[in-house]
Interface confidence: low
């Protein structure tokens, strides 16, 4: 189903504002009608246009060359260019064959302003829209061009062809038609208004500047379809593929017609399966069939005649070569010639597009760009070359700092970095309690080598990972004072290092006398247990970087703070010790700030108060 | 055909403004998807600058990204291109054109320059430092 926006952007698509109505009357217009677009005959033939399980539909693009003229490489489409609507939206059905698809209602049409050229090049192609949910709309994509030049004359026939585009085929046909008052087979002749005296006889129409010149018009069977129908006798009515009935009227695939060939049926009105002449396309090197009373014609490119068009008369006067290549051969008419093409075109005129990116050139992960006059590669960091074959040394003269060694890996260079360090070249202070190491809600306190786990009741371990009693008893030993058991805000550390903490306490002490004092709660630092003496004992600094908790006293109202903001208020905590365990609780009265590096914004850690020599830190 | 008139170019000092106009006339029986413009600086490759759809939406080649704003006016059958903070990189014929997108308005920048269905004849920019 196609959503309401997209219907919008079809019915804008359909009127561009900035292409407006004619404001003088063209010569004529070219038309073009597709008869079926599908997968050729043989094998390898593509099963649907439509990728798996996503709807599309198909629209068309010809856009019109003179013939004569030497085309550039990047030329626009001299005579005109249309696109047409798009066609009812297919959907694949798996395991059906493969159908030809359905395809958008009515002609293209190109307007001309001059002379109809009578030879003239064309190039058509067919566009998949797919509808899935991609970002920014539908995706479109090229499925075949065809190309090809022919002769043509205003006012004639429709004529038919054949063209195969890889496993594609497109079978359509053709006419250009004069815009009254023009007339002729280039429509360069102006027809005087009916009502001027005239000296024709009766049914005929009167022409400047040749006043003695008239012209029978050519008139089809009344009623004759105008779409569907044509005629090249008067009061005749022959019907384009597809379609059937005396005026052309009915479309062949709503009746239960088994070939859109021979005579009509009397009984059904349907058409009794024949062999068409122009089936198979007789006509060869790209000529157009058009069936005739009696047979078929050929209406041949430029330098081919006979028959079927099977004999080449080209020569590189006849600028048989497109998109800008170059004609190779003699001027005479019996001498072959060869198209050299340009980069990013193909086949025995030039008249295919190649995807070069489909090649994929690039190595080791490039992006490739098809400029047009050459490709190019985009490469991955740590390759270089013309298709990023080189594979560059990305350590050679980069160091890492702080200890840091480089690691070359997928060509790209980085750096392991010792531990408390990282980003590109280890020169920013890493935090080691990011990854959020000590389980069973224990609490990560980063150390300049490492960190340590201070561990919630029952657990123990490195990083937390051992229950204290496997069989479920309870491990917690009394609180302290004033701190009650059963206090979520509590955290127990290992005795051990509950010991070491002690034994460092001093030191500590000593040690953080010296940090300046500073009031400002945004910059929070230290916090002190409530009437304890100023500065007895420190927090363990930056502790608490990885855990929700409940900010205020246990017994207070209090507020959620998350320890993973980075620029909130950094609380932190006060122990209180007591053999063989620490306990844990925060004050909200800040004091010291944390300290800082020399850069804006990037905190450093604070020595931990006891020595590291003691410690093991994993 | 449809035919493609630009104006507006001239010589101006780096930093400067222009605002480029293409009037398009002529006559389409179908539509086309995008109008736009690209540029040609002598012994340079051709490059897409700006391409607008018929939705508006709009895309910029990176050198251009936030100084050109392109627009159209459909009532006046005009697609603009203003042209702000110039540099003197941005020396160049500066060319309307008209045509099928191919894949989306950010491609039609590329479609342009390969194919366009229609073009104009264009209008010197120079930018002098």
């Known amino acids: 189903m196609v959503s309401p926006r997209m219907s919008g952007l079809l019915s804008q698509t359909v009127i561009l504002a900035l292409i407006f109505l004619p404001q003088t009357r063209p010569a004529g217009v070219f038309e073009l009608q597709i008869h079926s677009f599908g997968p050729g005959p043989g094998p390898g033939a593509p099963r649907s246009p439509c990728s798996a399980r996503l709807p599309c539909r198909l629209f068309f693009r010809v856009c019109l060359k003179p013939g004569l003229s030497e085309e550039a490489a990047e030329s626009p489409c001299a005579l005109g260019a249309a696109l047409s609507a798009r066609g009812p939206v297919y959907t694949e059905q798996p395991g059906a064959p493969a159908p030809d698809l359905p395809l958008p209602d009515g002609l293209l049409q190109v307007p001309f302003r001059d002379a109809w050229p009578g030879t003239f090049s064309f190039i058509i192609e067919t566009w998949r829209e797919e509808l899935g949910d991609q970002i920014g709309g539908p995706a479109w994509s090229l499925l075949a061009r065809v190309a090809g030049r022919r002769r043509l004359a205003a006012g004639g026939p429709w004529a038919r062809d054949i063209q195969r585009a890889g496993a594609w085929e497109l079978r359509f046909s053709y006419r250009a038609r004069c815009e009254p008052p023009a007339v002729g087979t280039a429509c360069t002749r102006l027809c005087r208004p009916r009502s001027a005296p005239s000296r024709c006889g009766p049914g005929l129409r009167p022409c400047a500047p040749l006043e003695d010149e008239c012209e029978a018009p050519l008139v089809c069977r009344a009623g004759c379809s105008p779409e569907h129908g044509f005629c090249e006798q008067p009061g005749e009515c022959r019907c384009l593929e597809g379609w059937t009935g005396p005026l052309c009227t009915v479309p062949v695939s709503t009746s239960s017609c088994l070939s859109p060939r021979g005579p009509s049926s009397a009984t059904t009105g349907c058409l009794v399966p024949g062999p068409g002449p122009c089936d198979g396309n007789p006509c060869a090197n790209g000529g157009s069939c058009s069936e005739t009373p009696r047979s078929f014609e050929c209406t041949c490119p430029r330098g081919f005649y006979g028959l079927r068009c099977e004999v080449s008369g080209v020569t590189c006067a006849d600028g048989p070569c497109f998109n800008g290549g170059l004609c190779v051969g003699g001027a005479d008419p019996d001498s072959a010639y060869i198209c050299h093409c340009p980069p990013g075109f193909q086949g025995s005129n030039c008249e295919k597009r190649v995807d070069r990116c489909s090649l994929q050139p690039c190595r080791n992960g490039g992006l490739c760009l098809d400029l047009g006059h050459a490709l190019r590669c985009r490469c991955r960091a740590g390759f270089a070359g013309p298709r990023c074959e080189h594979d560059l040394d990305d350590c050679a003269g980069r160091a890492c700092a702080n200890g840091g060694t480089c690691v070359e890996g997928g060509g790209a260079h980085r750096c392991s970095c010792a531990l408390g360090f990282g980003g590109r070249d280890c020169r920013e202070r890493a935090d080691p309690c990011a990854a959020r190491p000590c389980a069973h809600g224990g609490r990560c306190y980063a150390h300049f080598s490492g960190l340590v786990c201070a561990c919630a009741p029952g657990y123990m371990g490195a990083r937390c990972e051992f229950p204290v009693h496997p069989d479920g008893a309870s491990a917690l030993p009394a609180a302290p004072p004033g701190l009650r058991p059963g206090d979520p805000q509590r955290y127990l550390l290992p005795p051990a290092l509950g010991l070491l903490v002690a034994a460092g306490v001093a030191g500590a002490a000593l040690l953080l006398v010296h940090v300046r004092r500073r009031g400002h709660s945004q910059d929070a630092g230290s916090r002190l247990l409530a009437g304890t003496p100023e500065p007895s004992v420190h927090a363990l600094p930056d502790a608490l970087n990885n855990l929700r908790t409940q900010e205020g006293s246990g017994d207070g109202p209090s507020s959620s703070v998350d320890w993973n903001r980075p620029e909130d208020v950094d609380p932190q905590g006060i122990y209180v010790i007591s053999a063989p365990s620490i306990y844990a609780r925060e004050v909200a009265t800040p004091l010291f700030p944390p300290l800082h590096t020399g850069r804006a914004g990037q905190r450093q850690h604070l020595l931990f108060p006891y020595p590291s020599s003691i410690l093991s830190v994993k | 055909q449809v035919r493609l008139v630009e104006s507006g170019g001239g010589s101006v000092q780096a930093g400067g403004s222009l605002r480029l106009s293409c009037v398009a006339s002529g006559y389409f029986y179908n539509t086309y998807y995008f109008m736009g413009w690209f540029r040609q600086a002598p012994g340079k490759e051709r490059e897409g600058v700006a391409a607008?759809?018929?939705?508006?939406?709009?895309s910029y080649a990176d050198s251009v990204k936030g100084r050109f704003t392109i627009s159209k006016d459909n009532a006046k059958n005009t697609l603009y291109l203003q042209m702000n903070s110039l540099k003197p990189e941005d020396t160049a014929m500066y060319y309307c054109?008209?045509?099928?997108?191919?894949?989306?308005?950010?491609?039609?920048?590329?479609?342009?320059?390969?194919?366009?269905?229609?073009w104009g004849q264009g209008t010197q920019v120079t930018v002098s430092s």
């Open positions: 054109a008209a045509g099928f997108g191919y894949m989306n308005v950010i491609q039609a920048l590329n479609g342009m320059r390969q194919n366009p269905d229609y």
């Open positions: 607008i759809d018929t939705d508006g939406r709009t």
